[in-house]
């Protein structure tokens, strides 16, 4: 199974001799997840033409995927550490149902999909330790998640491929925005 960052001293993303700080661990963890997404996107792009689809086609798929906006305080303009951290954690919690959906969507990268899901859970725990304002973090309702999952799995093949592509692309974007923001904290 894929090794989580920090479990293997040979991990190239951590060339430090001294123990990693909390911020470095989080940074390394996000980069590990992004590497996993990269592998999943490669499989998705190889088996369908979704990666070259226009934004208009993507917009037809009415997924309510978490997205960073100016008001979330994670961009350079209007940067706000507390607001941003809440948005990152809330967004990751919202992505969990979509990561669950991805679990049966890959053949050669099945383990990678599981690693991305498990690593995201660990990342949420890291970030919750860092957050002061945990009260502001809303966790999605399990029943809502269950019905969403059922709905996504009932789509036709083309829509499922599109959904997979869109989840991966959006999760990549969200993590990269998070990474940039966390580096300012």
């Amino acid at each position: 199974a894929p090794v989580l960052p920090g479990e293997d001293s040979k991990d190239v993303a951590a060339p430090h001799s001294q123990p990693l700080t909390s911020s470095e661990r989080i940074d390394k963890h996000i980069r590990y997840i992004l590497d996993g997404i990269s592998a999943l996107r490669k499989e998705t792009c190889n088996r369908s033409n979704m990666c070259e689809s226009s934004k208009e086609a993507l917009a037809e798929n009415n997924l309510n995927l978490p997205k960073m906006a100016e008001k979330d305080g994670c961009f350079q303009s209007g940067f706000n550490e507390d607001t941003c951290l809440v948005k990152i954690i809330t967004g990751l919690l919202e992505f969990e149902v979509y990561l669950e959906y991805l679990q049966n969507r890959f053949e050669s990268s099945e383990e990678q999909a599981r690693a991305v899901q498990m690593s995201t859970k660990v990342l949420i725990q890291f970030l919750q330790k860092k957050a002061k304002n945990l009260d502001a973090i809303t966790t999605p309702e399990p029943t809502t998640n269950a019905s969403l999952l059922t709905k996504l799995q009932a789509q036709n093949q083309w829509l499922q491929d599109m959904t997979t592509h869109l989840i991966l692309r959006s999760f990549k974007e969200f993590l990269q925005s998070s990474l940039r923001a966390l580096r300012q904290m």
Partner: antibody, heavy 123, light 107 residues
Framework: QVQLVESGGGLVQPGGSLRLSCAAS????????MTWVRQAPGKGLEWVSS????????AYADSVKGRFTISRDNAKNTLYLQMNSLKSEDTAVYYC????????????????WGQGTQVTVSS | DIQMTQSPSSLPTSLGDSVTITCQAS??????LSWYQQKPGQTPKLLIY???KLQTGVPSRFSGSGSGTSFTLTISGLEAEDLATYYC?????????FGQGTKVELK
């Protein structure tokens, strides 16, 4: 092949405005971060501004913050830099650059550069 | 803001020599450092990204090392076409910052 072609440079008076454009071709533009870098005559490189793929997230150098605005039109494969309240120290060649890799980018690095467009701010 | 200190600013050398340029960050930038080569009248060219990864098409005599705050670009066996100005760039956090540049020239 990948091509980045800048336009819109020229001579402008202090306090004036210019809009630079960068036409991109040979790659899926919407998948890539794009950046403007400038170089004053006889000086080194200076990072100016970056815009990310779909998030609308932008970043600026302190020297241009509040005066310059970066934007992109993914449908037209074009990157823009709106420059207002121009100062003499903004005189430089402005390069449009593409960030490494479209599928995953945690590492910054500019793998393709346009030929640059000259901006001269003088009275 | 993270400051980048590149040294030396000028490096008189001879063809065939091994050349080392260093870049120091004012705080840790992990491995988010890239190196560029610029010849007079030309656009910059990416040599190294991620501190040590060689960009496609770049000769293997170029290598990068380091992480955290200290980074090095090495040219093993300088060739005439390598005479240029070299810049490092921190891409860890905004505002991103280039080093001041190192001009590699003949003695």
């Amino acid at each position: 092949q990948v091509q980045l072609v800048e336009s819109g440079g020229g001579l402008v008076q202090p306090g004036g405005s210019l809009r630079l454009s960068c036409a991109a071709s040979g790659f899926t533009f919407s998948n890539y971060y794009m950046t403007w870098v400038r170089q004053a005559p006889g000086k080194g490189l200076e990072w100016v501004s970056s815009i990310y793929s779909f998030s609308g997230d932008t970043a600026y150098a302190d020297s241009v913050k509040g005066r310059f605005t970066i934007s992109r039109d993914n449908a037209k494969n074009t990157l823009y830099l709106q420059m207002n309240s121009l100062k003499s120290e903004d005189t430089a060649v402005y390069y449009c650059t593409r960030n490494l890799g479209g599928v995953v980018v945690t590492t910054n690095g500019y793998d393709y550069w346009g030929q640059g467009t000259q901006v001269t701010v003088s009275s | 803001d993270i400051q980048m200190t590149q040294s030396p600013s000028s490096l008189p050398t001879s063809l065939g020599d091994s050349v080392t340029i260093t870049c120091q960050a004012s705080q840790s930038i992990s491995d988010e450092l890239s190196w560029y080569q610029q010849k007079p009248g030309q656009t910059p060219k990416l040599l190294i990204y991620g501190a040590s990864k060689l960009q496609t098409g770049v000769p293997s005599r170029f290598s990068g090392s380091g992480s955290g705050t200290s980074f090095t670009l090495t040219i093993s066996g300088l060739e005439a076409e390598d005479l240029a100005t070299y810049y490092c760039l921190q891409g860890y956090s905004w505002p991103f910052m280039f080093g001041q540049g190192t001009k590699v020239e003949l003695k």
